[in-house]
Amino acid sequence: ECGHISVSAPIVHLGDPITASCIIKQNCSHLDPEPQILWRLGAELQPGGRQQRLSDGTQESIITLPHLNHTQAFLSCCLNWGNSLQILDQVELRAGYPPAIPHNLSCLMNLTTSSLICQWEPGPETHLPTSFTLKSFKSRGNCQTQGDSILDCVPKDGQSHCCIPRKHLLLYQNMGIWVQAENALGTSMSPQLCLDPMDVVKLEPPMLRTMDPSPEAAPPQAGCLQLCWEPWQPGLHINQKCELRHKPQRGEASWALVGPLPLEALQYELCGLLPATAYTLQIRCIRWPLPGHWSDWSPSLELRTTERAPTVRLDTWWRQRQLDPRTVQLFWKPVPLEEDSGRIQGYVVSWRPSGQAGAILPLCNTTELSCTFHLPSEAQEVALVAYNSAGTSRPTPVVFSESRGPALTRLHAMARDPHSLWVGWEPPNPWPQGYVIEWGLGPPSASNSNKTWRMEQNGRATGFLLKENIRPFQLYEIIVTPLYQDTMGPSQHVYAYSQEMAPSHAPELHLKHIGKTWAQLEWVPEPPELGKSPLTHYTIFWTNAQNQSFSAILNASSRGFVLHGLEPASLYHIHLMAASQAGATNSTVLTLMTLTPEGSELH
């Protein structure tokens, strides 16, 4: 060994100075008599070494590094040897910080593993090997007086938690607990916790289960769930309070909390939920009223609430077949009575024969909003209900009676926009209870089965805006029937368009006779088209060679026209314009020439 380094301290605070000396022995004969000692930190040469020959002939170089800013580096003492640098000795330098005070020390008693688990935050990186030890002692009082020490708990490398096993614990008695952190630059200790392990017990949550339906128990009400829970075995005799949380599986709803519930309730009916909805539920518990920690939330239980019977009003309307008055077509519309009126699975129309107590004969069962059935000869009334798995709506009676009430008057209709029609009337006297308004395509496309209908509950209404199934350029038949206590009035009807179309083309002009100063024209009118309003008039236009224009307005029933006052032997351009309230259309242009003065008239 030719050289040897010694340092003031191999481990220092990061940024602190460090002094090192390197001594080269005299007996290294292969060296220069006056060798120059060089210093290297890591890969970098360090200037500032002060070299001297000592009395015993050895060479010494001393260097002070003003700031050691590397957390770990090798300091080497070297000599130039030929073209290369020869390392004589090297030492490892480390720099870092003393341990910060560990903070946020907390402990949980785990009754499953029968151990006290403590965890802490170690604080900022020290850059040095730092050991943590969980220290504790038993204490009779509030930890002011120290009892038996408990064996130190040393966490595995890199972990910031440690378990004190049951054999070192004394339950229902205080323990002093703290963490000690130690490295080459110092020692620090966390603030001491004083706790009874049972006061930091963390329970496991109960296991949620659905209640097995028992034959004698009433089924849950709509919007309710019946559930029960199995308490966690190790906590059977620990007083706890629990809370339940639930949310619908679908949608973005947040958890709703229910509690506190006593653990020993063991079963619970949760109400106020949406009917026929799948919910996710969880439960958690805490030792109470004594101190403790909340358990984690239990695994989820997924349950569906029962649905409620439909809560709807059924507006009804009926029609008899003209050829067979006992065949009735019944129509209805469900009107929700509450925000959540329940799912409707289907509808039943039934009849109860008089004198047969309890006997109900179904006439039809359907998912549609209408049905056709044969009305028994003695039946004057049927009942209609909506149903689902939870039950039926209140029955709606439908009475089949003659039209004995007064009729409404002055029924009229007008377009509001291309997709709506206003129908108005003068109410009869006395006021009806309401009206049924029906509408559908008028002739030739009219069909009883394709009519839309609405119930107007206000008997004082004088009109109704039809917004459903209204399209432009279609002729609609609108039928309004007044409804009275036990009867109805006669139906009235009116026809209307929500928007009419201009004529698609004007009739073709034909020349019938021509003379020197006149021309007789004729045309065949276009047949009326559905959705097109009737013609109001024609206008005939003619233009001479000098581009002078003339016109005449003719009524809609015209089939021809004679142009007078024409110039002989002159060219004329003529066209016909057919007009309705919805617009006008021009025919193609007819060009003709009047006869020369010496020519004979053409007929």
């Epitope: 029968s114 339950l171 030792r287 004594l290």
Partner: antibody
């Protein structure tokens, strides 16, 4: 200091009924499970029944199920054991006990003797 | 239900002896095992709870160990006042059965 005082024991004919009471003091009665343990003459200890702090959970030993009913009145700090259809094998000293959170019988009363004999 | 088997049912020992009583559960009960001492004509007294925790006021010569199904009560140096019957009891379930008892007598 915790004290438990049983009463209501005595001689009863087979098929008869008896109601034991246990008056508790020195602790917050409504926070603890309570229980009954019996000991037949010259025999070991036998757990009979226990009751949760608010009375919602009441497990029983198979030997007494359907015949005995445990109950409590937290306002009176009293535990009860209603014993019906008594049999000779129910003859024992009945102890009232306060349970700890980990299910141990923390404190015991002095016991009351029930003798079922014709 | 979890049954408890205690052994021996009786033993004779001298003052100063180390005495060991065992208790076996028919299935795992974690640490939910308690030991009681009963002297003739007296109510039982809790010695050890949760397998190894000494009840307040109980001398430190009594100790408990074990977990799962096998448990032990040890009296390190038997004293005259320790001659009594000892019972184990599980509290893992609602049905809290006792062992059959071990009678410790003077040799």
């Amino acid at each position: 200091e915790v004290q438990l005082l049983e009463s209501g024991g005595g001689l009863v004919q087979p098929g008869g009924s008896l109601r034991l009471s246990c008056a508790a003091s020195g602790f917050t009665f409504s926070l603890y499970w309570m229980g009954w343990v019996r000991q037949a003459p010259g025999k070991g200890l036998e757990w009979v029944s226990s009751i949760s702090s608010s009375g919602g959970v009441t497990p029983y030993a198979d030997s007494v199920k359907g015949r005995f009913t445990i109950s409590r009145d937290n306002s009176k700090n009293t535990l009860y054991l209603q014993m019906n259809s008594l049999r000779a094998e129910d003859t024992a000293v009945y102890y009232c006990a306060k349970l700890g959170e980990l299910g141990m019988f923390h404190k015991w009363g002095q016991g009351t003797l029930v003798t079922v004999s014709s | 239900d979890i049954q408890m088997t205690q052994s021996p049912s009786s033993l004779s020992a001298s003052v100063g002896d180390r005495v060991t009583i065992t208790c076996r559960a028919s299935q795992g009960i974690s640490s939910y095992l308690n030991w009681y001492q009963q002297k003739p004509g007296k109510a039982p007294k809790l010695l050890i709870y949760y397998a190894s925790n000494l009840q307040n006021g109980v001398p430190s010569r009594f100790s408990g160990s074990g977990s799962g199904t096998d448990f032990t009560l040890t009296i390190s140096s038997l004293q005259p006042e320790d001659f009594a019957t000892y019972y184990c009891q599980q509290s893992w379930e609602y049905a809290m059965f006792f062992g059959g008892g071990t009678k410790v007598e003077i040799k």
